[in-house]
Every structure is written in structure tokens, then in C-alpha cells.
């Protein structure tokens, strides 16, 4: 039975040209995290595997940095980066948990972090 929950940074905003940290956290389970995938819509950004380390998608290698932790840092943001991001946790023995973050990239300096929320 899957008892865990994914806590994410929720809805966030950032300025064009700046950077943002995408962060998820798996709680309420003793399951072992074996791999975390980061995806934007259906496009793979990066994978963090417990044994193999990080794989950054070649097309994002210049603007995506691994970490902190299992999170992902997006750099040199453009308005095209606005959209949904997903952290997909592969765990043993529970299986797969998915968290969602919505990022809005703003032209001006009114970017403000949204509240944290949980996805069961």
C-alpha cells in the first residue's frame, strides 16, 4: 500500500533571465527512493538515479543544474519555461509517486513564490 505523499513548492514564479529551484519531498513512507525523474509536460529534463547519479537531458545541459539534493535548478529562464513540471519518484517497495509544480516566468520583477501544498 502506498502511504507516502509528495510535498512540492507548488505554484511558483520567477523572473525572465533568472533561475529557480524545483524541489519535491517524499514523506510519510519508509520506501527507498531509487530514482527521481524531472519532466516538463512530456519532455524529460533530468534523472537522478541512486546508483548512477544524474543524467541531464542533452538539450537542457546548458541551463539545468542538478540539485540541491534531488531537486533541479533551472537557469536563464525564458517565458517559454512557463508551465507544468513533474517530479516522478520511483521507490521500493511502494512504486511511483508524482508531484506537480507550476512555474510562471514573468517579464518584470514582480515574481513571488507561491505557497507550499501537498499532493497525496
Amino acid at each position: 500500500m502506498m502511504t507516502g505523499t509528495i510535498e512540492t513548492t507548488g505554484n511558483i514564479s520567477a523572473e525572465k533571465g533568472g533561475s529557480i529551484i524545483l524541489q519535491c519531498h517524499l514523506s510519510s513512507t519508509t520506501a527507498q527512493v531509487t530514482q527521481v525523474n524531472w519532466e516538463q509536460q512530456d519532455q524529460l529534463l533530468a534523472i537522478c538515479n541512486a546508483d548512477l547519479g544524474w543524467h541531464i537531458s542533452p538539450s537542457f545541459k546548458d541551463r539545468v543544474a542538478p540539485g540541491p539534493g534531488l531537486g533541479l535548478t533551472l537557469q536563464s529562464l525564458t517565458v517559454n519555461d512557463t508551465g507544468e513540471y513533474f517530479c516522478i519518484y520511483h521507490t521500493y517497495p511502494d512504486g511511483t509517486y508524482t508531484g506537480r509544480i507550476f512555474l510562471e516566468v514573468l517579464e518584470s520583477s514582480v515574481a513571488e513564490h507561491g505557497a507550499r501544498f501537498q499532493i497525496p
Epitope: 530514482q35 543524467h55 537531458s57 542533452p58 545541459k61 511511483t96
Partner: antibody
């Protein structure tokens, strides 16, 4: 088109070292990890290690730690694998291969380099 | 280590036949499995990645399916150039490991 060209066949004595090169062309060298795989005569495929030219970081199959050392020269888009303390059972074809876009698989392969260890 | 068991180890088939090769990892690897084709004296060539995705240039008669601990490579209509050895490989942990290979021979 993407191409990996490896150095030529080598014959070495037991205890010696050998350095195999893999020259990449047709893509941005630093964006893709480079993998090394070996195939002993008449046998299957065995993964040795891979290196990320972007940061120089390597990940090894534990079985080949101390045996293989990976390096890159990004200025000439070339990856290298040095094998030390060669034994007769290191006789094999050694392949370099470019990593995939979506994970730790091998998208494009070099032609292979036969390393023969014999006294 | 994740062990990759391929079956059969060899098979004989005719041009036009439908051919199926199975790969069974020793533990759940989700869909992190690739397939390669190798002809004698040549380097392997990627056929399938992530269990079912075809790289550009690979003929559509090749298809992959499965997840977890049960995967299949299917050649819908065997062509003369398909006689070769096929390997599966997981890409889910260290060490990356390959199956022992399946040799497809002419009947």
C-alpha cells in the same frame, strides 16, 4: 552524422597498460556521456564505465574500478579509456558509445578496438 | 546486480516470420530497458530504448513492449538483414547489465 572512430587494434603483454581513444564528430561532444563496453571473443556485452565530458565525472562498474580509467579531451572531442595491469582475460573488443538522450542507454557505437593480451 | 535473462538463447526462423524475444530482469526496472542488434564482426546498434521507443532510422517492423520484469522485442516480418544477435540492457542501476543475447538464424 554522428560518428565515433576508435583507435586501432593493440597487442599487449600481461601486466602492461593500453590506452584506447574514441574521436567523436557530428554532435556537441560535451552534451552526451561517453560509455565503454567490452566483448570478449564469442561472449556477450559488459559495461565498463561512462564519463560526462561536461564536468569530467565518471561512473564505473565496480568490477572495473582500478582496471579502467576514463578521461576526455573536449578540445578535440575525444574520449579515452586506459586499461592497466592487463591479463589474458582482458582480451576483448572494446567499444565506445555515446549515451542516449533519455537515460543510461547507448545510442551510437564506435567500430570497436580489439585489445589482445598475450605473452 | 540486476540479472537480465533472455529467451530463447537462439532461434531459427524464415523470412517473413514474426519473431518474439523475451527479456526478464531479476527485479523491477519500470520501463528502463533497451534492445540492441549485433551482426558478426560489427558493433551493436540501438533498436529500442525505454522499452518501446524507436530511434530514428530503425524500421517500424521492430517493436518493444513490457514493463517491470517482463519485456518483449518483436520483429513483425523478419527480413534477410535481421539475422543477427539481439541483446537487452537495463538502464536503471549500477552496474548496467546486458542479457546474454539471442541469436536469430535462418531456418
Amino acid at each position: 552524422q554522428v560518428q565515433l572512430v576508435q583507435s586501432g587494434a593493440e597487442v599487449k603483454k600481461p601486466g602492461a597498460s593500453v590506452k584506447v581513444s574514441c574521436k567523436a564528430s557530428g554532435y556537441a561532444f560535451s552534451r552526451y556521456s561517453m560509455y565503454w563496453v567490452r566483448q570478449a571473443p564469442g561472449q556477450g556485452l559488459e559495461w565498463i564505465a561512462f564519463i560526462d565530458p561536461y564536468n569530467g565525472g565518471s561512473t564505473y562498474n565496480q568490477r572495473f574500478r582500478g582496471k579502467a580509467t576514463l578521461t576526455v579531451d573536449t578540445s578535440i572531442s575525444t574520449a579515452y579509456m586506459e586499461l592497466s595491469r592487463l591479463r589474458s582475460d582482458d582480451t576483448a573488443v572494446y567499444y565506445c558509445a555515446r549515451g542516449g538522450d533519455y537515460g543510461w542507454y547507448l545510442g551510437v557505437w564506435g567500430q570497436g578496438t580489439l585489445v589482445t593480451v598475450s605473452s | 546486480d540486476i540479472q537480465m535473462t533472455q529467451s530463447p538463447s537462439s532461434l531459427s526462423a524464415s523470412v517473413g516470420d514474426r519473431v518474439t524475444i523475451t527479456c526478464r530482469p531479476s527485479e523491477n526496472i519500470y520501463t528502463y530497458l533497451s534492445w540492441y542488434q549485433q551482426k558478426p564482426g560489427k558493433a551493436p546498434k540501438l533498436l529500442i530504448y525505454n522499452a518501446k521507443s524507436l530511434p530514428s532510422g530503425v524500421p517500424s517492423r521492430f517493436s518493444g513492449s513490457g514493463s517491470g520484469t517482463d519485456f518483449t522485442l518483436t520483429i513483425s516480418s523478419l527480413q534477410p538483414e535481421d539475422f543477427a544477435t539481439y541483446y537487452c540492457q537495463h538502464h536503471y542501476g549500477n552496474p548496467l547489465t546486458f542479457g546474454q543475447g539471442t541469436k536469430v538464424e535462418i531456418k
